[in-house]
Interface confidence: low
């Protein structure tokens, strides 16, 4: 008949499993429960995948691995205290008197429950990596953490190569024994120990669970170290950089940690497993029953088969590991799980020209000299598109691309961003917002939805903010509907008249030049250079200012660059930014200072694109360590990452304007990196490429 084979990972667990099997059989619970002996949770997952066992209870990290690598699914979840349900929360606690935030953890002293423990290590370290705050090179998480914090107590890290830093705050027991042991000998071990490490001033932040502070303050602890502690003297660090009261853990935490869950193969009926266990818990979860499912005391251990704190088992509705783990925990695991043995020795960079090959070669040598991992290899291609093809075909690994190429790389070749460029805050030529500017005083105030028949001013044909984005956005929103892919005619028919300077005016609709004025002599009308006074972003704004047009499509800085005395030319000298407004996609108007919330799109920075199976954290980890050495254009280390002047070129490998490589954070897809508005505009334009 039908049977369910439970996988046990130790002798005590095998003993308890045998007793459970007997108790179920005695109670007539079907199907039969059998016990298979594995050597570890990992081994059990392999046995289940190989159809030699059927079920095991796993923690969050193991559920992630089992789901991702072996296709197993969670079907039954544990519930602990009623208030939180099938999860608890990993939090970062600080003293109220300190000024630490999640963004200023670098260099502070840290207290952890133990090495590789969920809330004390896996979640905080994974979260810091995944959010880009902590960069890891070559999968060496221990080194990264030891460099990041200004000393730690991580019980169990004594056997690692970084014990000096990771055990620096540990103190052992009262006689100094057991320093940094992953056991109660170390006074700073476990939840209460990590909190004690913070409370006694050894550390500045403690990574514990949501209930730890409240369980160890306000007179709730018997040990002398905690008796005088008040919960109000501590706060939680929130992911958005703020802090909150220790009771606010539902809103302010690093991750919701999912409860342990029973996992099975994808082809196993989860309902059957739940019915089996539900019958069992109905009979065997109360005190005094012959067998107790949620107690391990009789076997001299803790948490055998199920966690001892389980109050109930519940069926899991959406049986996918992603849904059970939740995005917060899932993201943390992505940041943490990096197998040095599976890390490729090389990162093959795509190069497009002789100067770029030279710079890439120098970069490879410079990185190798500094023992940066993985090593760089340079592979040439004919064009950005060719790079994308070669990356998809696994002949190359990475290339830096511009916005439009990122779109193609993501949409057509399935590539994802691994790191991005960051430019100086005042550098508005490399990343900027596209805005639609209008006069404030127009008695007939119109909105973005009412542009038909208006007069428009554009920087020039093909300019990102002057043409591609606004026209793409208007096509995408259905306002402009080109026939037979004739965008020019469609735009000329949509607006009453326009000025769209162009270099090659063959077959160019006359209305697109109707508002142009040429030079002071009236010559060179509509030409795609500064002889046309309405050319470029400044010119398009001038076209609006001089009442030639009703709307100008420009960069967010254009208004400020030409008002409030910033441009002394006669046409601009008296202009005030307050006299202009922006048209917002939601149909509203806004102050020109509100460009971040009211724009047609943001032109994104360039990004390093890779295959989706590439570990993006190792790519960023390499670039981050590299830029510490080579990122400054004045460094003396023999190579300049963000400068191309030695190679008689510009923007080689990276844009020269880059000041730092940055992590992608939550923008892990091409759409996320580019932003919905920019993607929509590109889709509007690409829909017309017949």
């Amino acid at each position: 008949g039908m049977e369910v084979r439970w996988c046990a990972t130790s002798d005590p667990e095998q003993h308890k499993c045998g007793n459970m099997s007997e108790a179920f059989r005695e109670a007539g619970i079907q199907p039969s429960l059998l016990c298979v002996r594995g050597t570890s949770a990992d081994h059990c997952v392999q046995l289940i995948a190989a159809q030699e066992a059927d079920a095991i209870t796993l923690d969050g990290g193991a559920i992630y691995e089992a789901g991702k690598e072996h296709g197993l699914k969670p079907v039954v979840g544990e519930v602990y205290d009623q208030e939180v349900g099938t999860s608890y929360y990993a939090v970062a606690v600080v003293r109220r008197s300190s000024h630490v935030t999640i963004d200023t953890l670098k260099g502070v002293k840290s207290c952890h429950t133990g090495i590789n423990r969920t809330v004390g290590w896996n979640v905080p370290v994974g979260y810091l990596v995944e959010s880009g705050r902590l960069s890891v090179m070559g999968c060496d998480v221990l080194k990264a953490v030891s460099d990041y914090f200004g000393g730690s107590c991580v019980p169990g890290a004594g056997e690692t190569s970084y014990s000096e830093s990771l055990c620096r705050l540990c103190r052992g027991d009262s006689s100094g024994e057991g320093v940094c042991d992953k056991s109660p000998l170390e006074r700073y071990y476990d939840y209460s120990g990590a909190f004690r490490c913070l409370a006694e001033g050894a550390g500045d932040v403690a990574f514990v669970k949501h209930s730890t502070v409240l369980e160890n303050t306000d007179g709730k602890t018997l040990p002398s170290w905690g008796q005088a502690l008040l919960s109000q003297d501590f706060e939680l660090l929130c992911r958005d950089g703020s802090r909150a009261d220790v009771t606010e853990w539902r809103q302010c935490h690093l991750a919701r940690v999912p409860a342990h869950a029973v996992v099975v193969r994808a082809d196993t009926d989860g309902g059957l497993i739940f019915r089996l266990l539900n019958e069992g818990q109905r009979l065997f979860s109360h005190e005094g029953s012959s067998f107790q499912m949620f107690s391990s005391e009789a076997y001299g251990q803790k948490d055998l088969l199920f966690k001892d704190s389980t109050s109930e088992l519940v069926p899991i509705a959406t049986q996918t590991y992603e849904a059970w783990l939740g995005h917060e925990y899932l993201h943390a695991m992505k940041g943490l799980l990096c197998d040095p043995n599976r890390l490729p020795p090389y990162l093959r960079w795509c190069v497009l020209s002789t100067p770029e090959i030279q710079k890439c070669g120098d970069m490879a040598v410079a990185f190798r000299r500094q023992r940066l991992k993985p090593e760089i290899q340079c592979v040439s291609a004919k064009s950005p598109q060719h790079c994308m093809e070669r990356i998809q075909a696994e002949q190359v690994d990475a290339v830096t691309l511009s916005g439009e190429d990122i779109y193609t790389a993501g949409k057509t070749y399935g590539l994802v961003p691994a790191a991005g460029e960051h430019y100086a805050p005042e550098d508005s030529s490399n990343s900027y917002y596209v805005v639609a500017v209008v006069r404030r005083d127009s008695s007939h105030a119109f909105t973005l939805d009412e542009l038909r028949g208006k007069r428009s001013c554009h920087a020039g044909f093909g300019s990102p903010a002057g043409w591609d984005v606004p026209v793409g956005a208007l096509i995408q929103r259905g306002f402009i509907r080109p026939k037979d892919c004739d965008v020019l005619t469609a735009v000329s028919e949509f607006f009453n008249a326009s000025c769209v300077p162009v270099n090659n005016p063959k077959n160019y609709p006359s209305s697109l030049c109707a508002l142009c004025v040429g030079d002071e002599q009236g010559r060179n009308k509509c030409v795609g250079n500064s002889q046309e006074r309405y050319y470029g972003y400044r010119g398009a704004f001038r076209c609006l200012v001089e009442n030639a047009g009703d709307v100008a499509f420009v960069r967010h800085t254009t208004v400020f660059d030409n008002t409030n005395g910033h441009n002394s030319e006669p046409w601009a000298a008296e202009l005030r930014s307050e006299d202009y407004e922006l048209l917002c996609p939601n149909g509203a108007r806004a102050e020109v200072s509100q460009f971040a919330a009211c724009n047609l799109a943001q032109i994104p920075p360039h990004a390093v694109m890779v295959r989706p199976d590439t570990n993006i954290f190792t790519v960023y980890g390499l670039l981050d360590k590299a830029q510490d050495l080579f990122g400054d254009d004045h460094n003396k280390n023999g190579f300049k990452m963000f400068d191309s002047s030695n190679y008689h070129g510009q923007d080689l490998l990276f844009k020269d304007a880059t000041v730092r490589a940055v992590p992608v954070g939550e923008k892990t897809t091409y759409r996320g990196w580019l932003g919905l508005d920019y993607v929509a505009a590109l889709e509007g334009m690409s829909s017309q490429q017949c």
Epitope: D441, S442, S443, A445, F560, R576, D579, R589, S593, A596
Partner: antibody, heavy 119, light 112 residues
Framework: EVQLQESGPSLVKPSQTLSLTCSVT????????WNWIRKFPGNKLEYMGY???????YYNPSLKSRISITRDTSKNQYYLQLNFVTAEDTATYYC?????????????WGQGTSVTVSS | DFVMTQTPLSLPVSLGDQASISCRAS???????????LHWYLQKPGQSPKLLIY???NRFSGVPDRFSGSGSGTDFTLKISRVEAEDLGVYFC?????????FGGGTKLEIK
């Protein structure tokens, strides 16, 4: 409760630079508009300029190129610099907040700091 | 700049009386969006100005309902239905429809 507090020297010599600080508590200067106004002897109030949540500045054209408003978001402070001062700039200087909640009327003011320009 | 003219310059009243202050703008304060950005402030002796009324007639939080504002276009009025001792000080009107914002010259409310 939103509070603004001006600070700076009470006496400035002619042709020198007047520098004032506005310290804000109870609200973040990364939201809203943060303004400087001055009141001359005899009750006349003059609007000087603002720095907005996104760091954009506006200056009253009457002050031309003499004025600069800057900020330090980490300290939640913003600053006024007025160059080449004359006796005409003797006034009480106020900082004030404007937000959308009151349609950009100045809903909270500092207590003011009196500045005399004299040699 | 847009000139705001307040009358009277000084307004002597007895406690409990009604007081009325007028403010006239040199041009209409109706913005192209239909709103009128006319505000009233009170500066008590030794204090900074405090917002009383925004956008013609909206009382700011904490302002007693004996204060009311009215008007349109270029002519506006602030009324205090029953003057109390704590209402004494200088009243200013201000417009922010046009840039830069400008203030009236002030009306001093004092005891007869």
């Amino acid at each position: 409760e939103v509070q603004l507090q001006e600070s700076g020297p009470s006496l400035v010599k002619p042709s020198q630079t007047l520098s004032l600080t506005c310290s804000v508590t109870g609200d973040s200067i990364t939201s809203g508009y943060w303004n400087w106004i001055r009141k001359f002897p005899g009750n006349k109030l003059e609007y000087m300029g603002y720095i907005s949540d996104s760091g954009i500045t506006y200056y009253n054209p009457s002050l031309k190129s003499r004025i600069s408003i800057t900020r330090d978001t980490s300290k939640n402070q913003y600053y006024l610099q007025l160059n080449f001062v004359t006796a005409e700039d003797t006034a009480t200087y106020y900082c004030a907040r404007r937000t959308l909640a009151t349609y950009y009327a100045m809903d909270y003011w500092g207590q003011g700091t009196s500045v005399t320009v004299s040699s | 700049d847009f000139v705001m003219t307040q009358t009277p310059l000084s307004l002597p009243v007895s406690l409990g009386d009604q007081a009325s202050i007028s403010c006239r703008a040199s041009q209409s304060l109706v913005h192209s969006n239909g709103n009128t950005y006319l505000h009233w402030y009170l500066q008590k002796p030794g204090q900074s100005p405090k917002l009383l009324i925004y956008r013609v007639s909206n009382r700011f939080s904490g302002v007693p309902d004996r204060f009311s504002g009215s008007g349109s276009g270029t002519d506006f009025t602030l009324k205090i239905s029953r003057v109390e001792a704590e209402d004494l000080g200088v009243y200013f009107c201000s417009q922010s429809t046009h840039v830069p914002p400008t203030f009236g010259g002030g009306t001093k409310l004092e005891i007869k």
